[in-house]
Each structure stands twice: as structure tokens, then as C-alpha cells.
Interface confidence: low
């Protein structure tokens, strides 16, 4: 006697998130009469996905017309697949009765969902650091499946090697997240530099996603100070120059002190950028030599980006 078989021809089906998945199922006999139902998983906790008999399944449509008396194709199409749809689906034949009796199950089709990773988000250190220091950048991307993923770091197009990467969770999941921390040694030339986190995944068809961070947000380049005296003018005034060079960011306050007393305070603003992204600033102070009996100690005091002030002093000689 020919026995009813429920055939699910594909052991596995892989679908990209957002697409539709077709799960094929064929029954080899119209007898006995009774509905087909689709479940995800097995045992008492299995989830009903579709029933010919009853219920509302907005994302599921039968491939063939189930009202046809001679229909033996019980394939379904699930629309707008998400990673949460991953699992093993079973096509199950029931014998009509009160209640219906489970008769035969297909071998199951494992649905895996190829979900693209989210755009990598790169975050840098909370506080700025100076050249020669190592700073950490973190890259995160979420929601991808399958778990296999490749992450690379670049600085100005050059691949970095000092980084640690974790993919979570470690076990089986509908989707995964990746987090990577790269250590980057800063140089004074890094104001215009970028770090790039590049994520490659099967869903991206060879086109990696990139997240970027500008090192300008992470670096502080402290200024060089130089105080010089120009030759004395005919009116007994001496021009003293304080050159503040190669600093970043622009946030800088300069104070002139004459013999320890504040003479003038200036704030840097709208400075032209050097080729390397740093800034230069020159401040002048005119000292009336005839107003002084003794040598004048001039101090150029620079407070850069909230850091402790840096001083450079210069003595203006007053001839007897």
C-alpha cells in the first residue's frame, strides 16, 4: 500500500533580509483528507507559521491554490524576511478529525537569513591625546547574519594590525554584532588623518561598509613658543614677538605679563590652517623702555585647549 509522504526537497534555504523565502513542500497523496500546517521548530513549543484550515498569516502566502481539490503542492512564500525568521520549518500533514491528528512531517527546511551589517560606527577617545600617545577607537556593527564577518582597520589607507575584535553572541543566534577596538599611535601630522573601520560580509557582495573617524577629534598638538625682540625703535619702544606655532585645536589663550603683571590677554580665532592642519599665531607687545628703570621681564603665557599654561620669558634690557 502506497503511504503518504511529505517531501521537503531543500534541506536549507538562504535568503537576504527583506526578500521573500519560498519553502517547498509536496505531499505524495491526496489521501487521507486533512489540512497541511507549517511549523517552525519541533515539540510542544513549536510555532505555527501557516495553516490551510484557519488563522490569519499576513506574511505567508501559499504558492499554489490551496482550494484546488487535487492540490499537492503545499509550498509557502514568506515575505519580508528578517533575521528573526531564521530556524527550521516543517511541513506537517494532518488527518481530518475532531481534533485533527498529525499524520506525517517533512524532514524540515532550515531557513538562514543573510542580514547586512549596519553601517559601522566608529567612536574615538573621550579626551584628546598628544603625539606619541596611543588612543583607542571602537567600531561597532550590528544585526548581521550569518556570523562570519571580516573587519579591518585602516589609517589613511594603510591597514592597521593592533586591534581586538569580538563577535557576539558566541552561540547560535538570529543575528550578530561585532565590536572591535583599534589602538592608534598619534603623530603630530595626524590632524588630517582618518581611521577607517571596514566590514566585509557575504551580504555585501564584495563591497565592504566603512565607518570613519577623524583623528582631529582625538589629537592635541601642543604649541611651540618662541619670544624674540625686534630692534629698538626711535621712540624708545621695543617690539617683542611671541610666536606660537604648530598647535591644534585652535582653542588657545595668550597672556602677556610684564614683570609678572598681566598686560594683555588674547584669544585665538579664525586662524589660517597650516597644510598639516595645525595653526600658527603671532602676538606682539610694544614695551616703552623709557618708562622703566630696570630690565623688564616679559612673559608670554599660553593656555592651549584647557591644558596647564606654558610660559616663555624674555628680558628687555634697559640701558642706564
Amino acid at each position: 500500500e502506497e503511504e503518504l509522504q511529505v517531501i521537503q526537497p531543500e534541506k536549507s534555504v538562504s535568503v537576504a533580509a527583506g526578500e521573500s523565502a519560498t519553502l517547498n513542500c509536496t505531499a505524495t497523496s491526496l489521501i487521507p483528507v486533512g489540512p497541511i500546517q507549517w511549523f517552525r521548530g519541533v515539540g510542544p513549543g513549536r510555532e505555527l507559521i501557516y495553516s490551510q484550515k484557519e488563522g490569519h498569516f499576513p506574511r505567508v502566502t501559499p504558492v499554489s491554490d490551496p482550494t484546488k481539490r487535487n492540490n499537492m503542492d503545499f509550498s509557502i512564500r514568506i515575505s519580508n524576511i528578517t533575521p528573526a525568521d531564521a530556524g527550521t520549518y516543517y511541513c506537517v500533514k494532518f488527518r481530518k478529525g475532531s481534533p485533527d491528528v498529525e499524520l506525517k512531517s517533512g524532514a524540515g527546511t532550515e531557513l538562514s537569513v543573510r542580514a547586512k551589517p549596519s553601517a559601522p560606527v566608529v567612536s574615538g577617545p573621550a579626551v584628546r591625546a598628544t603625539a606619541e600617545h596611543t588612543v583607542s577607537f571602537t567600531c561597532e556593527s550590528h544585526g548581521f547574519s550569518p556570523r562570519d564577518i571580516t573587519l579591518k582597520w585602516f589609517k589613511n589607507g594603510n591597514e592597521l594590525s593592533d586591534f581586538q575584535t569580538n563577535v557576539d553572541p558566541a552561540g547560535k543566534s538570529v543575528s550578530y554584532s561585532i565590536r572591535s577596538t583599534a589602538r592608534v599611535v598619534l603623530t603630530r601630522r595626524d590632524v588630517h588623518s582618518q581611521v577607517i573601520c571596514e566590514v566585509a560580509h557575504v551580504t555585501l557582495q564584495g563591497d565592504p561598509l566603512r565607518g570613519t573617524a577623524n583623528l582631529s577629534e582625538a589629537i592635541r598638538v601642543p604649541p611651540f613658543l618662541e619670544v624674540t625682540q625686534q630692534s629698538m625703535r626711535a621712540d624708545n619702544q621695543v617690539n617683542v614677538t611671541c610666536q606660537v606655532t604648530k598647535f591644534y585645536p585652535q582653542r588657545l589663550q595668550l597672556t602677556w605679563l610684564e614683570n609678572g603683571n598681566v598686560s594683555r590677554t588674547e584669544m585665538a580665532s579664525a586662524l589660517p590652517e597650516n597644510k598639516d592642519g595645525t595653526y600658527n599665531w603671532t602676538s606682539w607687545l610694544l614695551v616703552n623702555v623709557s618708562a622703566h628703570r630696570d630690565d623688564v621681564k616679559l612673559t608670554c603665557q599660553v593656555e592651549h585647549d584647557g591644558q596647564p599654561a606654558v610660559n616663555k620669558s624674555f628680558s628687555v634690557k634697559v640701558s642706564a
Epitope: A119, F154, N156, G157, N158, Q194, I196, Q205, G206, D207, R210, T212
Partner: antibody, heavy 119, light 107 residues
Framework: QVQLQESGPGLVKPSQTLSLTCTVS??????????WSWIRQHPGKGLEWIGY???????YYNPSLKSRVTISVDTSKNQFSLKLSSVTAADTAVYYC???????????WGQGTTVTVSS | DIQMTQSPSSLSASVGDRVTITCQAS??????LNWYQQKPGKAPKLLIY???NLATGVPSRFSGSGSGTDFTFTISSLQPEDIATYYC?????????FGGGTKVEIK
């Protein structure tokens, strides 16, 4: 600064292979910008991206041309090349090579070379 | 492939006019969009990268904005030397694709 110069025959017979070379001067093909692209423009039409190559040799081709395209790099000569096989009159176009920086778009282009496919 | 729809395909404006070109992507491309200028017989020239950043040496009358699927390119005050065809280009997904171009002429 970096400059690009396309070279190759201006006339190719149908069914033959179109071969063009882009010479990079003023900088190394191996450093800085990782992508080196070929783009073409049919007469009086818009721009069509053909594909790119990393200095490492990794390539990606436009699926519309993938079966016929090969892009290769010769770092010793500071050049990268385009080969397009089984050409037809529809491949008549101005072919450009360009540098694609990580975040600067295609910021350096060759002046373009006109290739006519005709017997 | 991502489709890039540029409009208008051509426009005519007077010197000093504000000119606006739009570019629409067939799906979200974040801000991965460049704008190019191509003068007759010349290679394209990068004007704007990452949707809104001005390329080196490009006059400030050129600007770009937008994110996701809708982008705008603006010339704040049209100059005679701006006669050209302008293209948008997405680089969010391979293959990279260009808009059909907008030809800008002087009235």
C-alpha cells in the same frame, strides 16, 4: 601632485580585446588612495563606472560588464590596466582612469582616451 | 544596482542666478554621494564629496546637501565658467553609479 594618463589604441576591431593602460605619476600607486577606477562615457551620454582595483590587486567589476572585464595593476611600473574582451560598436566611448580616495570621491582623473570599435 | 535619478536633465539660467540640481537614489545611501562637474571635452572634476564637503580648490559658491535618498547640489551665484554638465555619483553600494547628468547653460 598625482596625475593620470591613459594610453592605448584608439581603434579596435569588433570581437577583439580593448586594452588600455593608466600611468600614475607624482605618487605611488601602492600608497595613499586604495582604489583605482576605470570609467567610460559613450558619445553624448553619461558616465558608466567599469570597475576598480586595489593596489593589492583586489578587483570589483560592474556586473553589467563583469564577464568581459579584467583590471590589473603593475606596481613596478606604477600602472593599472583595463582589458575589455569581445568588443562591439556599443563599446565605443571615451575611457577615463581615476583615483578614488577613501573619502574624497574620484579626485584625480586622466584626460580620457577615445576608443572606437570599428572594422 | 542603485539607480540615481538626476533632475532636471538640463537648465538655462542667467549669470548670478541660484541654480539647484537634485539627485534621488533608489534606496538609502546615507551620505555616500559625490558631485562632479564636466566641461565639454574634459574629464569630470570632483566638486563635492560625502554629500556636502567641498573638494579642495572648489569655489564656495558650490554646495551640496542631503542624506538617505534625496540630495541637492546648489550653485549660489552662477558664473559663466560654470557652464558644464553636473553628475551625482553614489558609492554606498557596488557597482558605483552615476546620475544621468544635468547640463547647465547660460541664458
Amino acid at each position: 601632485q598625482v596625475q593620470l594618463q591613459e594610453s592605448g589604441p584608439g581603434l579596435v576591431k569588433p570581437s577583439q580585446t580593448l586594452s588600455l593602460t593608466c600611468t600614475v605619476s607624482g605618487g605611488s600607486i601602492s600608497s595613499g588612495s586604495p582604489y583605482w577606477s576605470w570609467i567610460r562615457q559613450h558619445p553624448g551620454k553619461g558616465l558608466e563606472w567599469i570597475g576598480y582595483i586595489y593596489a593589492s590587486g583586489f578587483t570589483y567589476y560592474n556586473p553589467s560588464l563583469k564577464s568581459r572585464v579584467t583590471i590589473s595593476v603593475d606596481t613596478s611600473k606604477n600602472q593599472f590596466s583595463l582589458k575589455l574582451s569581445s568588443v562591439t560598436a556599443a563599446d565605443t566611448a571615451v575611457y577615463y582612469c581615476a583615483r578614488e580616495g577613501y573619502h574624497s570621491g574620484m579626485d584625480v582623473w586622466g584626460q580620457g582616451t577615445t576608443v572606437t570599435v570599428s572594422s | 544596482d542603485i539607480q540615481m535619478t538626476q533632475s532636471p536633465s538640463s537648465l538655462s539660467a542667467s549669470v548670478g542666478d541660484r541654480v539647484t540640481i537634485t539627485c534621488q537614489a533608489s534606496q538609502d545611501i546615507s551620505n555616500y554621494l559625490n558631485w562632479y562637474q564636466q566641461k565639454p571635452g574634459k574629464a569630470p572634476k570632483l566638486l563635492i564629496y560625502d554629500a556636502s564637503n567641498l573638494a579642495t580648490g572648489v569655489p564656495s559658491r558650490f554646495s551640496g546637501s542631503g542624506s538617505g535618498t534625496d540630495f541637492t547640489f546648489t550653485i549660489s551665484s552662477l558664473q559663466p565658467e560654470d557652464i558644464a554638465t553636473y553628475y551625482c555619483q553614489q558609492f554606498a553600494y557596488l557597482p558605483w553609479t552615476f546620475g544621468g547628468g544635468t547640463k547647465v547653460e547660460i541664458k
